[in-house]
């Protein structure tokens, strides 16, 4: 998170001859694995099932659409984002049950946790992408029939991991390994040692870029959006909306704890008993962001089912009705139904 | 009392081995680690490694690892430490330290207790 | 590795004065344990180092109470609260957080 992984140790996992005695007491330590990481290790198992399956039947089912339709490019970059994150999963998982050793060397340590943050910031920003796609449909039609093609929108999805990329990079490079003398153990973390404005620098960064701001606008844009499609007949558009605002919203609640945890963090001295009972839930906070990974497939398979009523086709046919939708090509340009939609809405409104 | 007796000084040619000793009295040798640090003439203090008596466990700072060699004989009650390929620079005075696993409010073997009187090792050709 | 560092490098003191050295280490000695392993040793003249303070600011038996440590983190500072000849010498810090264990380059406590 924003400071070293400073949890209770244990040396139970140690070679025999590694150890002084089972029995020999060590300061403030612990032969059992606590509650919350226990339980981030449920979470993260979890996750790793649901995320890696449901995420590469995501980039399946969309993969194939995205040349065409601009929808399947939005889920299409998502479902990379997450896919990526679920990866790190393993080895993650093996550190918490390890009792956060780290045997996976300096390199590791500074790409694997960092994915996370990639998928995080990579996330938000496709989710502001694609939140002001909706809006621009809604809002600005013909704009969207003269200019909203699939190359525009594969160089937003450029924009957003290139500046994903760029926001995880202080974290990235703050990220050490350390081996403790005793119990003998390598940890892996953010070490910003004499430089506590910066630690606070990169944390409150974090808070409002990659959760504040975001939340703020996307609030906004989604009010006018949903104002708008209240005030009009239901149209095919609908489903996309209510599948991108609940993306968004599981967005902001799995990523609420960590974010939360992440700034207190940062303002608390590393010796202090609050800063000691956060870092003892860091595995739980990051775990429970991760949720981010595998949530999405989820919300398009219940989304899935609610427009067909039941789950009478395949996933993947199911997947694709919700990912991606027919495109209509009139006058050589290609666009949604849901454009076309929206683009006659609003000529019976003028 | 705690005792920590060191051989005596060494003369030795670049390029050889030593071989230090360190004799425990006092208290119970495999009950403690031992520590090893080596101290350059009006310098600071390094840290060469330690050595679990009990199990024969050894820890090495990796700047001693290929040259330190630690080793404890439980009969006698005596850590050793071997140096080789000696250099000008491994001229210096080096102590055993012993480390307790628990002292007052702390459990682990965290600081040197007791030190030996030091054993000074000279490096000439 | 950690490095320790120490100042002042000297200290000429007269007795009964208070003296204050410094100690900082290029990373956190919190050990993930919450503790900070950072002790403080005095070598006399021609002898071994002898250990005063361990864990920052537990005092070591025998050692008088006029010797106090604080800290935390990165940075620690031993004090002494009236200076006596017996504690004139080289004040060494050391961390046993990390590996390898490190000492600070000392500083004398000597007589103005």
């Known amino acids: 998170m924003n400071s070293f992984n400073y949890t209770t140790p244990d040396y139970g996992h140690y070679d025999d001859k590694d150890t002084l005695d089972l029995n020999t007491p060590v300061d403030k330590t612990s032969n059992t694995l606590r509650v919350p990481d226990i339980l981030a290790l449920v979470i993260f198992a979890v996750v790793f099932l649901v995320g890696v399956l449901g995420n590469a039947l995501v980039v399946w089912v969309t993969a194939f659409e995205a040349k065409r339709t601009i929808n399947a490019i939005w889920f299409l970059n998502l479902a990379v984002a997450d896919f990526l994150s679920c990866l790190a999963l393993p080895i993650l998982f093996t550190s918490i049950v390890q009792h956060h050793h780290w045997p996976f060397g300096g390199a590791a340590c500074s790409i694997l946790p960092s994915l996370i943050l990639l998928n995080m910031y990579a996330s938000i920003l496709l989710l502001a992408t694609i939140s002001a796609d909706r809006f621009l449909l809604v809002f600005k039609p013909i704009w969207c029939q003269n200019f909203r093609g699939a190359g525009l929108a594969w160089i937003a999805c450029a924009v957003a991991w290139g500046l994903a990329l760029l926001l995880t990079i202080p974290s990235f490079l703050y990220r050490v390994v350390r081996e403790e003398y005793f119990p003998p153990k390598v940890l892996c973390g953010v070490d910003y040692s004499h430089d506590k404005r910066r630690e606070r620098a990169v944390a409150i960064v974090r808070l409002v870029l990659g959760f504040l701001w975001p939340l703020l606008t996307l609030t906004i844009c989604y009010t006018f959006i949903l104002l708008r499609t209240w005030s009009r007949r239901a149209t095919r558009s609908t489903k996309t909306l209510k599948v991108v605002v609940a993306v968004v919203a599981s967005f902001f609640i799995f990523w609420l704890p960590y974010q939360v945890t992440g700034i207190m963090m940062s303002f608390l001295e590393p010796s202090s008993p609050t800063f000691l009972l956060l870092n003892k839930l860091d595995s739980l906070c990051v775990s429970f962001a991760y949720i981010n990974c595998c949530i999405n497939p989820i919300i398009y398979v219940v989304a899935g089912q609610g427009f067909q009523g039941r789950l009478r086709k395949s996933l993947p046919s199911l997947l694709r009705n919700v990912l991606t939708e027919e495109s209509v090509v009139r006058e050589s340009k290609s666009f949604t139904r849901s454009t076309v939609d929206t683009m006659a809405q609003k000529t019976q409104a003028v | 009392q705690v005792q920590l007796q060191q051989s005596g000084a060494e003369l030795a040619k670049p390029g050889a081995s030593v071989k230090l000793s360190c004799k425990a009295s006092?208290?119970?040798?495999?009950?403690?680690?031992m520590h090893w640090v080596k101290q350059r003439p009006g310098q600071g203090l390094e840290w060469i490694g330690y050595?679990?008596?009990?199990?024969?466990?050894?820890k090495y700072n990796q700047k001693f690892k290929d040259r330190a060699t630690l080793t404890a004989d439980k009969s006698s009650s005596t850590a050793y430490m071997q140096l080789s390929s000696l250099t000008y620079e491994d001229s210096a005075v080096y102590y055993c330290?012993?480390?307790?696993?628990?002292?007052?409010?702390?459990?682990?073997?965290?600081?040197?207790?007791?030190w030996g009187q030091g054993t000074t090792l000279t490096v000439s050709s | 590795d950690v490095v320790m560092t120490q100042t002042p490098l000297s200290l000429p003191v007269s007795l009964g004065d208070h003296a204050s050295i410094s100690c900082r280490s290029s990373?956190?000695?919190?050990?993930?344990?919450?503790?900070?392993?950072l002790h403080w040793y005095l070598q006399k003249p021609g002898q071994s180092p002898k250990l005063l303070i361990y864990?920052?600011?537990n005092r070591f038996s025998g050692v008088p109470d006029r010797f106090s440590g604080s800290g935390s983190g990165t940075d620690f500072t031993l004090k002494i609260s009236r200076v006596e000849a017996e504690d004139l010498g080289v004040y060494f810090c050391?961390?046993?957080?990390?590996?390898?264990?490190?000492f600070g380059s000392g500083t004398k406590l000597e007589l103005k």
């Open positions: 990373q956190s000695l919190i050990h993930s344990n919450g503790n900070n392993y």
């Open positions: 864990k920052v600011s």
């Open positions: 050391s961390q046993s957080t990390l590996v390898p264990l490190t």
């Open positions: 330290a012993r480390v307790p696993l628990s002292y007052g409010s702390s459990y682990g073997p965290y600081f040197f207790d007791y």
């Open positions: 050595i679990n008596p009990s199990s024969g466990y050894t």
């Open positions: 006092g208290y119970t040798f495999t009950s403690y680690w």
